[in-house]
């Protein structure tokens, strides 16, 4: 069974202040079962932009309907971007587990804010 | 609290056609996959078919092609049409919340489909 | 799709430990829950995404899995526990809901 792999199209986006970033994600497989999270940053201090399964995110939508049993269209849109936003973003799935395993990240997505057209 | 609200349950003959729904309250419908889920008297749970928020459906094996999903999220109502029912779709129909992961978290009381000549 | 098995009863003396096994089904492919269903009444969650337990479920119900047996375990059973427990498992494959036979829990 070929490998799961977690795919981030673009390298890096660019969104004046005030509007939204999309910021696409796709894995190859469902399998194993579990959840896919966004951080901004790596390592211990990174932080949690958007997780499937719980928590209340209300600047992050996703793109495709998270419900459909076959989705794996895992992209976000962030809504009124500001420059404190900017930093790269990573899309990472884990699989089940107590608690959850991280098991393949994307790679990365920078995202850098212009300044609001006057 | 979050409510579901099952109805239009009743006696009918084989070959006849039914419509269930099931009234949703206490939270986003909209934002739900949803489920039917069936017990045949002094029987086990059965998955009719799930539903998602944006109304792709799924059939367990021994309905597809009789049992229609739907759902109106301006209304708050799933929806199950029946056709051609047979005895062996006697039954309990209970509709589900499902949870992110297409399991089940709150139920409905269910309503009673009885198919009988 | 795949089969869940359950043993058809368990039976328990009150402030006992009761387990109820469920086996089938591929861990890395398969969510689990335990549904509690009472005689005449709607079933009711008390264990989801294999460990999970409702807020409003009482903590001496847990989950567990090992391999592809799941089990559910009541600490101090008490007599209101006494129930038939349904498995019910999510197959990320093939994208279909299964139950098991349902276990009968009786508090001797």
């Known amino acids: 069974e070929e490998e799961l792999q977690v795919i981030q199209p673009e390298k890096s986006v660019s969104v004046a202040a005030g509007e939204s970033a999309t910021l696409n994600c796709t894995a190859t497989s469902l399998i194993p079962v579990g959840p896919i999270q966004w951080f901004r940053g790596v390592g211990p201090g990174r932080e949690l932009i958007y997780h499937q399964k719980e928590g209340h995110f209300p600047r992050v939508t996703p793109v495709s309907d998270p419900t459909k049993r076959n989705n794996m269209d895992f992209s976000i849109r962030i809504s009124n971007i500001t420059p404190a936003d900017a930093g790269t973003y990573y899309c990472v799935k884990f699989r089940k587990g107590s608690p959850d395993v991280e098991l393949k990240s994307g790679a990365g997505t920078e995202l850098s804010v212009r300044a609001k057209p006057s | 609290d979050v409510q579901l609200v099952e109805s239009g349950g009743g006696v009918v003959r084989p070959g006849e056609s039914l419509r269930l729904s099931c009234e949703a309250s206490g939270f986003t419908f909209s934002s739900n996959a949803m489920s039917w889920v069936r017990q045949a008297p002094g029987k086990g749970l059965e998955w009719v078919a799930g539903i998602s928020s944006g109304s792709d459906t799924y059939y367990g094996d021994s309905v597809k092609g009789r049992l229609t999903i739907s759902r109106d999220n301006s209304k708050n109502i799933l929806y199950l049409q029946m056709n051609s029912l047979t005895a062996e779709d006697t039954a309990v129909y209970y509709c589900?919340?499902?949870?992110?992961?297409?399991?089940?978290?709150?139920w409905g009381l269910g309503t009673l489909v009885t198919v009988s000549s | 799709s795949y089969e869940l098995t359950q043993p058809p009863s368990v039976s328990v003396s009150p402030g006992q430990t009761a387990r109820i096994t469920c086996s089938g089904g591929d861990y890395y492919s398969t969510y689990y829950a335990w549904y509690q269903q009472k005689p005449g009444q709607a079933p009711v969650t008390v264990i989801h995404s294999d460990d999970k337990r409702p807020s409003d479920i009482p903590e001496r119900f847990s989950g567990s899995s090992s391999g592809t047996t799941v089990t559910l375990t009541i600490s101090g059973v008490q007599a209101e526990d006494e129930a038939d427990y349904y498995c019910g498992g999510y197959d990320g494959r093939t994208y279909i809901n299964t139950f098991g036979g349902g276990t009968k829990l009786t508090v001797l």
């Open positions: 589900a919340r499902e949870t992110w992961n297409h399991l089940f978290d709150y």
